[in-house]
């Protein structure tokens, strides 16, 4: 006879799964806030900075009532993938000025990647429909100047911070509806 069967496989508690995702998101939110503050200290922002290639804001007070778990996770994953690509681009093409943000920018990239894998796992554990593979995104043009790289960094970190902030709020809300 073979080895005795192991304990019955317990299906994951969705609230606990969501809890750990919230913790990771909160942690990344704090990291992003610190890095954005570091950037502001080194290169003060003059006014607001935008980057057309960044995703548009997906959540607001008005949208909270209609939130559904599959939609939130799919959209959050898509937006964070875009931010991951922008952070990678920033590290590669941002210029020597932004080298002063290393190793923090590298750590942020690794943690963002980890959160994305966590979201993917959460979607499969909750048996949510998996999004189709992402189409290859057009390459991001290198910044036109050193100052262009700094402006892009302000836009990327500011947008990521705002996205994560709403993500925590949305995920906390969804947890109460499970």
């Amino acid at each position: 006879p073979g080895p005795p069967p192991g304990p019955p496989r317990v299906s994951p508690d969705p609230r606990a799964e969501l809890d750990s995702t919230v913790l990771l998101t909160r942690s990344l939110l704090a990291d992003t806030r610190q890095l954005a503050a570091q950037l502001r200290d080194k290169f003060p922002a003059d006014g607001d900075h935008n980057l057309d290639s960044l995703p548009t804001l997906a959540m607001s007070a008005g949208a909270l009532g209609a939130l559904q778990l599959p939609g939130v996770l799919t959209r959050l994953r898509a937006d964070l993938l875009s931010y991951l690509r922008h952070v990678q681009w920033l590290r590669r093409a941002g210029g020597s000025s932004l080298k002063t943000l290393e190793p923090e920018l590298g750590t942020l990239q690794a943690r963002l990647d980890r959160l994305l894998r966590r979201l993917q796992l959460l979607m499969s554990r909750l048996a949510l429909p998996q999004p189709p593979p992402d189409p290859p995104a057009p390459p991001l043009a290198p910044p036109s100047s050193a100052w262009g790289g700094i402006r892009a960094a302000h836009a990327i970190l500011g947008g990521l911070h705002l996205t994560l902030d709403w993500a925590v709020r949305g995920l906390l809300l969804l947890k109460t509806r499970l």
């Epitope: 006014g47 607001d48 607001s60 007070a61 709403w166 925590v168």
Partner: antibody
Framework: EVQLLESGGGLVQPGGSLRLSCAAS????????MNWLRQAPGKGLEWVGV????????YYADFVKGRFTISRDNSKNTLYLQMNSLRAEDTAVYYC??????????WGQGTLVTVSS | QSVLTQPPSASGTPGQRVTISCSGS????????VNWYQQLPGTAPKLLIY???LLPSGVPDRFSGSKSGTSASLAISGLRSEDEADYYC???????????FGGGTKLTVL
């Protein structure tokens, strides 16, 4: 640097109207939900309402529903509070504040509204 | 009458640790993030703690927040004279569909 500057406060008679403005600068105004809050003299903070970043959704505290209206003009980076049918108990310092999620991360310095005959 | 309940006053001497409590219900603190604001005399409120225990940039780590069930607390260690202010807790309330505050706690540094 993020800045929020309220204006339009003053003395108004009960039953009267007033429109407050909040000029925003130093951030992408059209990305953020915006709120009005108030504080009666010597009292605590009270939330008045919120408007979504694109102006499509608004939530109000029960005590102002039907009397106060929040609006925004993203092209002018300005938030508004139209106050009608004012009462003595609406006397307060009114603040505008930015919301990136569940909290108010930047506040204006406030404008005083006095409702009295 | 405020939806969230805070003690009206608290006090401590310089260097001491003080804690301010905030209690609510499942529709606000129980299900939503708690935020804390500091209001120095004659000034606008300032965000002190968000999402229960996160510190915004520029807030010293002498300040900390925690939450358990339907209650939250703000702790200030190494108390300084400049910490003398009013402190407010806040959370979204699912039943009221709006933001609710505590009545505020006046902190005196003796």
């Amino acid at each position: 640097e993020v800045q929020l500057l309220e204006s339009g406060g003053g003395l108004v008679q009960p039953g009267g109207s007033l429109r407050l403005s909040c000029a925003a600068s130093g951030f992408t105004f059209s990305h953020y939900d915006m709120n009005w809050l108030r504080q009666a003299p010597g009292k605590g903070l009270e939330w008045v309402g919120v408007i979504s970043y694109d102006g499509s959704n608004k939530y109000y505290a029960d005590f102002v529903k039907g009397r106060f209206t929040i609006s925004r003009d993203n092209s002018k980076n300005t938030l508004y509070l139209q106050m009608n049918s004012l009462r003595a108990e609406d006397t307060a310092v009114y603040y505008c504040a930015r919301t990136p999620g569940s909290h108010f991360d930047y506040w204006g310095q406030g404008t005083l509204v006095t409702v009295s005959s | 009458q405020s939806v969230l309940t805070q003690p009206p006053s608290a006090s401590g001497t310089p260097g001491q640790r003080v804690t301010i409590s905030c209690s609510g219900s499942s529709s606000n603190i129980g299900n939503n993030a708690v935020n804390w604001y500091q209001q120095l005399p004659g000034t606008a409120p300032k965000l002190l703690i968000y999402y229960d225990d996160l510190l915004p940039s520029g807030v010293p780590d002498r300040f900390s927040g925690s939450k358990s069930g339907t209650s939250a607390s703000l702790a200030i260690s190494g108390l300084r004279s400049e910490d003398e202010a009013d402190y407010y807790c806040s959370a979204w309330d699912d039943s009221l569909n709006g933001v609710v505050f505590g009545g505020g706690t006046k902190l005196t540094v003796l």
